[in-house]
């Protein structure tokens, strides 16, 4: 009986460990500033790091600029987007800016894209100041299915702060779907 | 056999409970405004409450102004920082302000400090308005090792809102490191 | 013994599944713009969706404009509030605005209300720009007891962005109370 009990304990520890790790996908992706689009309109950001510095990914996939869900579940999604301008970068085309982020979900099965979260601000970045900065943070709890894709759209991408501590997004699984 | 089964069940419940609680350190620290530095430069905030009001800590340590990790894992870190100024407080030295927060990680083993997250905004707080307010929120998912320390740096600390609902930071463990 | 072991495994899987789901209440509530109060003063927002679009709730209750906790635990709470104004909506009563959010907790047993988190900004929305936008995000980790209620207060509710991706709040349980 003792041997059986040990076997039960062992298999349970094994199962608990395995299920726990399998049940918790996550990603933290940081901006890759080598390929930021020009323009001031809303664009999808496709270049992100997933394996350097603070960037990491597990049980999710990063492909074609999108974070792909591999495991059904409820996830907490977040994004932090920083914009900055220094007068040495040149004159802004307009001092009235819409600095926005949109966190979108795309379903391959039903080809459609929907905005899960948005944030931002209109700003007046006048020439009276040599430096301007603004950050946006959004976060929320969403049901995601395997195969669904998360992407980030921003306005004025050329104003993005390229630091890994400034412009990033991520997700972590909190619980299974019943 | 029944006795053995009960023993297995009992030990398992015990183990599950124990491992679950041990696996989930957390902290929510609120600003201690009795000791906020003056000046407008970037400073590390060292005075935080950990055991009054909304402030709490478990399986983490607060020491010398830093939140110390006791258990390896992936944590969600967050900070909310509020700045405010009322004309009754006197005139601002400058109306052009950089209101910023930096969440930093320090490793004792390799004495180095790195910024995990930053946020904020440049603001023009003109004398035309009697009251000014601005809040920053940042959050992200990071791998932390036992002994590493989390601290908060801000610009213009004398403008911090001292309320516990306004200026705080925290962390909670989401999962183990594989 | 094998039959007993299977029974132990079976009951354990059942228990683990059940306890896991019971242990993780959550809610993501999106603004119901059909009933937003007018005025610029601070008001409690009572109309939220809990079962359409991104809105969802499990093991928590939404009643009388409040999110009610059904299960003791430590929860991560968050809110995202967007304000906007277009010149076609008419002239603002004042160009100097306080755009604020307050996440409050009410205890029925001891009839009292406390602010857990606040955020926002004073803004100068001048007539020089045809469109204005601003978003606030707050989040934090709190101990909540069964029966306690979470509600959202904002200033200038008539300026709220009614989109489900813009104005929402939520919570998810992270761990039990020891």
């Amino acid at each position: 009986i003792r041997a059986e009990k040990a076997m039960v304990d062992g298999s349970w520890l094994d199962l608990a460990k395995r299920s726990k790790l399998e049940a918790q996908p996550f990603a933290h992706l940081t901006i890759n500033a080598t390929d930021i689009p020009s323009g001031s309109h809303k664009v999808s950001l496709s270049s992100w790091y997933h394996d350097r510095g603070w960037a990491k990914i597990s049980n999710m996939t990063f492909s074609n600029g999108k974070l792909i869900v591999n495991q059904d579940g409820f996830y907490y999604l977040y994004a932090n987007i920083c914009f900055r301008h220094h007068e040495t970068s040149g004159d802004l085309a307009t001092e009235y800016l819409q600095l926005m982020v949109y966190v979108t979900k795309t379903s391959i099965k039903i080809p459609s894209s929907h905005t899960l979260m948005k944030g931002g601000s209109t700003k007046y970045w006048s020439g009276n100041s040599e430096f301007h900065f603004y950050s946006i943070n959004v976060g929320g709890f969403f049901k995601l299915r395997s195969g669904e894709e998360i992407s980030i759209e921003v306005s004025n991408p050329s104003l993005l702060d390229p630091d890994q501590d400034a412009t990033y997004f991520g997700a972590f699984k909190v619980r299974d779907i019943d | 056999i029944r006795a053995e089964k009960a023993m297995v069940d009992g030990s398992w419940l015990d183990l599950a409970k124990r491992s679950k609680l041990e696996a989930q350190p957390f902290a929510h620290l609120t600003i201690n405004a009795t000791d906020i530095p003056s000046g407008s430069h970037k400073v590390s905030l060292s005075s935080w409450y950990h055991d009054r009001g909304w402030a709490k800590i478990s399986n983490m340590t607060f020491s010398n102004g830093k939140l110390i990790v006791n258990q390896d894992g992936f944590y969600y870190l967050y900070a909310n920082i509020c700045f405010r100024h009322h004309e009754t407080s006197g005139d601002l030295a400058t109306e052009y302000l950089q209101l910023m927060v930096y969440v930093t990680k320090t490793s004792i083993k390799i004495p180095s400090s790195h910024t995990l997250m930053k946020g904020g905004s440049t603001k023009y707080w003109s004398g035309n308005s009697e009251f000014h307010f601005y809040s920053i929120n940042v959050g992200g998912f990071f791998k932390l090792r036992s002994g590493e320390e989390i601290s908060i740096e801000v610009s213009n600390p004398s403008l911090l809102d001292p309320d516990q609902d306004a200026t705080y930071f925290g962390a909670f463990k989401v999962r183990d490191i594989d | 013994i094998r039959a007993e072991k299977a029974m132990v495994d079976g009951s354990w899987l059942d228990l683990a599944k059940r306890s896991k789901l019971e242990a993780q209440p959550f809610a993501h509530l999106t603004i119901n713009a059909t009933d937003i109060p007018s005025g610029s003063h601070k008001v409690s927002l009572s109309s939220w969706y809990h079962d359409r679009g991104w809105a969802k709730i499990s093991n928590m209750t939404f009643s009388n404009g409040k999110l009610i906790v059904n299960q003791d635990g430590f929860y991560y709470l968050y809110a995202n509030i967007c304000f906007r104004h277009h010149e076609t909506s008419g002239d603002l009563a004042t160009e100097y605005l306080q755009l604020m959010v307050y996440v409050t907790k009410t205890s029925i047993k001891i009839p009292s209300s406390h602010t857990l988190m606040k955020g926002g900004s004073t803004k100068y929305w001048s007539g020089n720009s045809e469109f204005h936008f601003y978003s606030i995000n707050v989040g934090g980790f709190f101990k909540l007891r069964s029966g306690e209620e979470i509600s959202i207060e904002v200033s200038n509710p008539s300026l709220l962005d009614p989109d489900q991706d813009a104005t929402y709040f939520g919570a998810f349980k992270v761990r039990d109370i020891d």
């Epitope: 020009s38 323009g39 085309a93 050329s158 | - | -």
Partner: antibody, heavy 122, light 107 residues
Framework: QVQLVQSGGGVVQPGRSLRLSCAAS????????MHWVRQAPGMGLEWVAV????????YYADSVKGRFTISRDNSKNTLFLQMNSLRAEDTALYYC????????WGYGMDVWGQGTTVTVSS | AIQMTQSPSTLSASVGDRVTITCRAS???SSWLAWYQLKPGKAPKL??????SLESGVPSRFGGSGSGTEFTLTISSLQPDDFATYYC?????????FGQGTKVEIK
Amino acid sequence: QVQLVQSGGGVVQPGRSLRLSCAASGFTFSGYGMHWVRQAPGMGLEWVAVISYDGINKYYADSVKGRFTISRDNSKNTLFLQMNSLRAEDTALYYCAKCLSGTYWGYGMDVWGQGTTVTVSS
Amino acid sequence: AIQMTQSPSTLSASVGDRVTITCRASQSISSWLAWYQLKPGKAPKLLIYKASSLESGVPSRFGGSGSGTEFTLTISSLQPDDFATYYCQHYNSYSWTFGQGTKVEIK
């Protein structure tokens, strides 16, 4: 593909008006500033006017200030140049051109129209 | 206003030659300088922006350099398709100024 198609040129008497149009396709027109540049017969290129992506900011060469007006309709992806009080020295081949950067001035003009001729003569 | 002076006005060269065109500003300027190629009956083509950045799709034989008051466009090995007129263009404080042009012709 990315292109700018111009129209509206012609022969006009001094003192009269003319409106040039530039229809954009293949890119997000509302995200970029737009220029008008001209080349008088046998001469070099001369910058005329620019408008920011949102239409808020407009700048003009001294030679046309007060007479020419640049505008845009982002819903129709079209740029305009309204030329009033035309003079003989305004005779030129007029080009519309897209700003390389939507956010900053100064990066140059990366897409050009085919040009349209304006002749001011009595 | 800042004046931009190109030299030479005309340049005779052969295929394979290394060609350098200079653009001088009347006072020290930022690096907001672009170079264009213009052929008869065609629209101008952007070659270089911000003094030294090569526009996408432009052959690598074209290069830009310089700062202060003197900027240069270099064609490392002249090709038959490169015979055209080249213009520098400077941006400063909401004003755009073109040089008078340099015509590169066959020797």
